[in-house]
Interface confidence: medium
């Protein structure tokens, strides 16, 4: 296994006061049983609201590297391949669960954390505010 | 909290053979510190590739309720509000980590699981296969 400089403040697995602590088996089971899932791997380029992927790294988190979608344009790509500013490219956001080492550097103690990530972009009709 | 009938086969927290097991604190910390994140709440209706949200519930999973997007149309909505079948509405899929009670009904023993969810839809140019 891995040898980690252990934080002396690491909680004891048997500590009954460690709040709402559970045992979690890290052999991640993959429930994506559909043998032909429609992968979104190239949608970022083919979309009328295309996006780029930006890297966000945090060594104390699993997964340590999260690639976030950033819409390429304010508008959407029209049939001529030009940006139409009468429409808006907007990020679709989703909360995901990640694990954070807590206290930091403890090899077998984690905290669940929710973070909001942008998964991709979609093209929407803008909300127009009419001034009286 | 919820009272769950305890499975007599639940693993012992101190069992050193319980595979790749760590302690996880379930007091979920929310890192979405932006007090007004641009939520995608109404994008499902305003998108050129609109979607409906379907509820998926599983009491043995955390989170137990997951909302799944299903694209409303095969094509995309054009400027006239009609469906244009020269373009495709496609789901943007994302894997999320969830916790599954394992063995079932054990209150403090979980397994990490990856599941694929559709978060929303985007409008893409179709891939055209030319037959020789």
């Amino acid at each position: 296994g891995i040898t980690i400089p252990r934080n002396p403040g690491c909680p004891n697995s048997e500590d009954k006061n460690f709040p709402r602590t559970v045992m979690v088996n890290l052999n991640i089971h993959n429930r994506n049983t559909n043998t032909n899932p429609k992968r979104s791997s190239d949608y970022y380029n083919r979309s009328t609201s295309p996006w780029n992927l930006h890297r966000n790294e945090d060594p104390e988190r699993y997964p340590s590297v999260i690639w976030e979608a950033k819409c390429r344009h304010l508008g959407c790509i029209n049939a001529d391949g030009n940006v139409d500013y009468h429409m808006n490219s907007v990020p679709i956001q989703q909360e995901i669960l990640v694990l954070r080492r807590e206290p930091p550097h403890c090899p077998n103690s984690f905290r669940l954390e929710k973070i909001l990530v942008s998964v991709g972009c979609t093209c929407v009709t803008p909300i127009v505010h009419h001034v009286a | 909290g919820i009272t769950i009938p305890r499975n007599p086969g639940c693993p012992n927290s101190e069992d050193k053979n319980f595979p790749r097991t760590v302690m996880v604190n379930l007091n979920i910390h929310n890192r979405n510190t932006n007090t007004n994140p641009k939520r995608s709440s109404d994008y499902y209706n305003r998108s050129t590739s609109p979607w409906n949200l379907h509820r998926n519930e599983d009491p043995e999973r955390y989170p137990s309720v997951i909302w799944e997007a299903k694209c409303r149309h095969l094509g995309c909505i054009n400027a006239d509000g009609n469906v244009d079948y020269h373009m495709n509405s496609v789901p943007i899929q994302q894997e999320i980590l969830v916790l599954r009670r394992e063995p079932p009904h054990c209150p403090n023993s979980f397994r990490l699981e990856k599941i694929l969810v559709s978060v929303g839809c985007t409008c893409v140019t179709p891939i055209v296969h030319h037959v020789a």
Epitope: G1, I2, I4, L26, I28, T35, N36, P37, R39, S40, S41, D42, Y44, L53, E57, D58, P59, E60, Y62, P63, S64, V65, I66, W67, I96, R101, P107, N108, V117, V119, G120 | R20, V22, I92, Q93, Q94, E95, L97, K114, V119
Partner: antibody, heavy 126, light 107 residues
Framework: EVQLVQSGAEVKKPGESLKISCKAS????????ISWVRQAPGQGLEWMGG????????DYAQKFQGRVTITADESTTTAYMELSGLTSDDTAVYYC???????????????????WGQGTTVTVSS | EIVLTQSPDFQSVTPKEKVTITCRAS??????LHWYQQKPGQSPKLLIK???HSISGVPSRFSGSGSGTDFTLTINGLEAEDAGTYYC?????????FGPGTKVDIK
């Protein structure tokens, strides 16, 4: 700049054990895993196993199960691969490769090997 | 385990020519397919990750496409320095596996 520096060439006898080190620099050690890949003379690449530093968890190819042990020391940012019960079939170049723990385009951990060590030549001969 | 097959095994190409290498997986692997280049006496080098994503520092003449079971690596305008062996690699499922390699040499 990311670098993986492996220990030097080894000559072993059948039945002996081998331990190769892989020292990582230029990146956060626990943000990545290390996989070990070998290449027999004139042959292709063969994945042996890997370690996810974040969890300290290991995975091994069935072919090497029971014979290979992969460990890591976070304090020295070094990973190790130990292979026991050597035979002449284990003559190969052994590489370590860095494996990101990534959430990429909506998916967890379908990982590429983004940086490789220079390789350690191992000869097993009586 | 997932078996990857590559074609061709060997290709002799003139500089500036277009090179296409294919990789087929024995089962669906989504886009968890990566391409490496290995020059004689050197370590492998990552060229393309997740089927089609380019790597910073890798020349733009290298591109990848495909998903599911069929993947392609394209070198648009081969250069002399591109001689070597190209491997595809799947990480959809343990054990991770590599294709047998395609050797490219310069005429």
């Amino acid at each position: 700049e990311v670098q993986l520096v492996q220990s030097g060439a080894e000559v072993k006898k059948p039945g002996e054990s081998l331990k190769i080190s892989c020292k990582a620099s230029g990146g956060s050690f626990i943000s990545y895993g290390i996989s070990w890949v070998r290449q027999a003379p004139g042959q292709g690449l063969e994945w042996m196993g890997g370690i996810t530093h974040f969890f300290g968890s290991t995975d091994y190819a069935q072919k090497f199960q029971g014979r290979v042990t992969i460990t890591a020391d976070e304090s020295t940012t070094t990973a190790y691969m130990e292979l026991s019960g050597l035979t002449s079939d284990d003559t190969a170049v052994y590489y370590c490769a860095r494996v990101p723990n990534e959430f990429w385009n909506g998916y967890y951990a379908t990982q590429d090997f983004d940086y490789w060590g220079q390789g350690t030549t191992v000869t097993v001969s009586s | 385990e997932i078996v990857l097959t590559q074609s061709p095994d060997f290709q002799s190409v003139t500089p500036k020519e277009k090179v296409t290498i294919t990789c087929r997986a024995s089962q669906e692997i989504g886009f968890a397919l990566h391409w490496y280049q290995q020059k004689p006496g050197q370590s492998p080098k990552l060229l393309i990750k997740y089927a089609s994503h380019s790597i910073s520092g890798v020349p733009s003449r290298f591109s990848g496409s495909g998903s599911g079971t069929d993947f392609t690596l394209t070198i648009n305008g081969l250069e002399a320095e591109d001689a070597g062996t190209y491997y595809c690699h799947q990480t959809e499922e343990l054990p991770y596996t590599f294709g047998p390699g395609t050797k490219v040499d310069i005429k």
